[in-house]
């Protein structure tokens, strides 16, 4: 057992032992994004396959109206892409009076929402400002890193237009965690 | 034992426990391309470094003809980066008759090859319009996500321009996969 | 136990187990950079927040002065995203004597010592060229693998110019590890 | 329920103006390019013009036809979008309606209003 | 500006026939997307992102193409089907829709 001879000599907290398989673990893939409520003042939410494809939820993490739920408390790795796609910027154009135009920019946010807390956090941001000429572009925001959660928090994936996000393929857009 | 006096009360399903240092893993690096045939209708594969540097292959996964063959079903996170330069582009140029250019563009994909099945998959994708003006350019594309894969799965990392890419260092091109 | 009848037919090395819980493992977020010494010849060190936010420590894994120190050898994943902002860039100028100028750039790595070595191992870079026209500009550069590290090696993420780096929010700019 | 009511039309000489209103509901307008998209009797769709959001300072965007007479602009707060149309010919005659924009289409469109330019 | 020419402009159709109409772009488009009219009707969407049937849309109906030359097909007609079918750019400003093709049952 854990703690016993294999224990290496610094080890002194005996921790439940864990199989891998039954960590909680999910990836979503895009689907076509129609106007939906959101919360006010606050980036829209995208929705997503759960199941379908290459999408999969197990282990009791749960997805449902465009939040993941955490099922168990530890450190979990998070991740998205989000693949954006637009028109011609116009951020090029002549500066009036001498002054550079605010940019275009398109912004991912993986959120965690906590009931007993008033406000989201924001846990990861990808923003880049768009400033492309001469032709249509597209281009993925990828973000990842680990967050120690909580049993019952939420996370969901806002992007700052919603309009521009390419859902044509499950492999350009997506979102996804895992206990690790 | 797993199951006993540590198990979280929610836990019913008793896997078999598994040693962290024994679980496929591999990291491989970029070296330089040479031309070789590739599927009709498909981006080039690239072909990597397993041994040397900061490349390894472990615990059965192993490397072979620019796939990496997965030992072991389960759930694997996969990832790449792909450094790209090029000349400039000229999807900026006066547009004729007041066209847009179609957008130069490059694009990443990890794609998984399974012997019964006729058609690769492709696992993830990312992929940008190149429309830089006035000098050279070099960018990177990163990937990284979760997939249930099946023992005997090959995977591979295709590119829209072989010769766009920048094998000059190995932390630039990357590749790697591991059994969580 | 590992080894007894749930142990996969193949598996024929007794590695000891280990809880996931008490593996080394980090999560810094940025804070803003005060000008420091660095190494001549190497972009500068990046310092970071361990403890405040969504900023941990956790089993033996420290930072200090710049670095997280590994406690314990192993496989790490090891990430950073770093959001970069500027001015309008000038490299898309029209070009001297016919010759594109060297554009402006952006460059991460993540780098690791080791007491024992002379020189340190960039085990991750992203680099891209700016060449944004018209206004001022920001985008990230997301970078992230696994490697083999040995107990007190450490990691630094060096950038190629600390004045550009968005040190504003926690969620844009970040840097963390785990033992897999 | 995702719902448009577009309001505003009526007779107008040419030369003339007049204002339309796109009240939205059942979605967060905020968060939607917002276009107007009329129609001649008889005659086939024509797009008219669009705005984008708050974080893209309101750009907006005309057909060749309009640019210049027309402007369209919009209240977040009230949930409405408006087509402020001066300069009219009798050519602008028909029924206007607004639809938010998605990057695929657009999904939703009002019952329309009629603009009459005639003297 | 983007023009889309749709052909025909009219076609008479008895049902259960193949149908055919297709949508030239003056220059590439990234998707093109296809909306349904009827009269006294506001339209609806149809067709998106060139392959993709609209909630509701039957799956008689399918739409093919890439670059400046697009489709859409009903591989047997029926008689709700006739309608006013437009195509509709939105890969470059200004957007445009093309002039429209009426489709009658015989």
């Known amino acids: 057992l854990k703690g016993q001879e294999f224990a290496p000599s610094h080890q002194q907290v005996y921790a439940p032992l864990r199989a891998d398989g039954d960590k909680p673990r999910a990836h979503l893939t895009v689907v076509r994004q129609t106007p939906t409520q959101h919360f006010k003042n606050q980036f829209p939410a995208l929705h997503w396959e759960h199941e379908l494809g290459l999408a999969f939820t197990k282990n009791r993490m749960n997805y449902t109206n465009k939040f993941l739920l955490i099922p168990e408390s530890g450190d979990y790795f998070i991740y998205s892409q989000v693949t954006f796609r637009g028109m011609t910027s116009e951020c090029s154009e002549i500066r009036q009076a001498g002054r550079p135009n605010k940019p275009d920019s398109i912004t991912v946010v993986i959120t965690k929402v906590t009931d007993s807390y008033p406000e989201p956090t924001q846990l990861l941001m990808g923003t880049k400002s768009v400033c492309e000429v001469g032709s249509n572009w597209f281009q993925p925001i990828y973000l990842g890193a680990m967050f120690s959660l909580q049993e019952g928090d939420k996370l969901m994936v806002n992007v700052s237009d919603i309009s521009l996000v390419d859902y044509t393929k499950e492999d350009k857009t997506f979102f996804g965690a895992f206990l690790l | 034992l797993k199951g006993q006096e540590f198990a979280p009360s929610h836990q019913q399903v008793y896997a078999p426990l598994r040693a962290d240092g024994d679980k496929p893993r591999a990291h491989l690096t970029v070296v330089r391309q040479t031309p070789t045939q590739h599927f009709k209708n498909q981006f080039p594969a690239l072909h990597w470094e397993h041994e040397l540097g900061l490349a390894f292959t472990k615990n059965r996964m192993n490397y072979t003809n620019k796939f990496l063959l997965i030992p072991e079903s389960g759930d694997y996170f996969i990832y790449s980066q792909v450094t790209f330069r090029g000349m400039t582009s000229e999807c900026s140029e006066i547009r004729q008759a007041g066209r847009p250019n179609k957008p130069d563009s490059i694009t990443v994909v990890i794609t998984k090859v399974t012997d019964s099945y006729p058609e690769p998959t492709q696992l993830l994708m990312g992929t940008k319009s190149v429309c830089e003006v006035g000098s050279n350019w070099f960018q990177p594309i990163y990937l990284g996500a979760m997939f249930s894969l099946q023992e005997g799965d090959k995977l591979m990392v295709n590119v829209s321009d072989i010769s766009l890419v920048d094998y000059t260092k190995e932390d630039k091109t990357f590749f790697g996969a591991f059994l969580l | 136990l590992k080894g007894q009848e749930f142990a996969p037919s193949h598996q024929q090395v007794y590695a000891p187990l280990r809880a996931d819980g008490d593996k080394p493992r980090a999560h810094l977020t940025v804070v803003r950079q005060t000008p420091t010494q660095h190494f001549k010849n190497q972009f500068p060190a990046l310092h970071w927040e361990h403890e405040l936010g969504l900023a941990f420590t956790k089993n033996r894994m420290n930072y200090t002065n710049k670095f997280l120190l590994i406690p314990e050898s192993g496989d790490y994943f090891i990430y950073s995203q770093v959001t970069f902002r500027g001015m309008t860039s000038e490299c898309s100028e029209i070009r001297q004597a016919g010759r594109p100028n060297k554009p402006d750039s952006i460059t991460v790595v993540i780098t690791k010592v080791t007491d024992s070595y002379p020189e340190p191992t960039q085990l991750l870079m992203g680099t891209k060229s700016v060449c944004e026209v018209g206004s001022n500009w920001f985008q990230p550069i997301y970078l992230g693998a696994m490697f083999s590290l040995q107990e007190g090696d450490k990691l630094m993420v060096n950038v190629s110019d600390i004045s550009l780096v968005d040190y504003t929010k926690e969620d844009k700019t970040f840097f963390g590890a785990f033992l897999l | 329920e995702v719902q448009l009511v577009e309001s505003g039309g009526g007779l107008v000489q040419p030369g003339g103006s007049l204002k339309l209103s796109c009240a939205a509901s059942g979605f967060t307008f905020s968060n939607y390019w917002m276009n107007w998209v009329r129609q001649a009797s008889g005659k086939g769709l024509e797009w008219v013009g669009g705005i984008r959001l708050k974080s893209n300072n309101y750009k907006t965007q005309y057909a060749e036809s309009v640019k210049g007479r027309f402007t369209i602009s919009r209240d977040d707060s009230k949930n409405t979008a408006y087509l402020q149309m001066n300069s009219l010919k009798t050519e602008d005659t028909a029924v206007y309606y607004c639809?938010?924009?998605?990057?695929?289409?657009?999904?939703?469109w009002g019952q329309g209003t009629t603009v009459t330019v005639s003297s | 500006e983007i023009v889309l020419t749709q052909s025909p402009d009219f076609q008479s159709v008895t049902p259960k026939e193949k149908v055919t109409i297709t949508c030239s772009a003056s220059s590439s488009v990234s998707y093109m997307h296809w909306y349904q009219q009827k009269p006294d009707q506001s339209p609806k969407l149809w067709i998106y992102?060139?392959?993709n049937l609209a909630s509701g849309v039957p799956s008689r109906f399918s739409g093919s193409g890439s670059g400046t030359d697009f489709t859409l097909t009903i591989n047997s007609l029926e008689a709700e089907d006739a309608a006013t079918y437009y195509c509709f750019q939105e890969s470059g400003y200004p957007f445009t829709f093309g002039q429209g093709t009426k489709l009658e049952i015989k």
């Open positions: 639809t938010p924009l998605l990057l695929s289409g657009m999904d939703y």
């Open positions: 992102d060139t392959s």
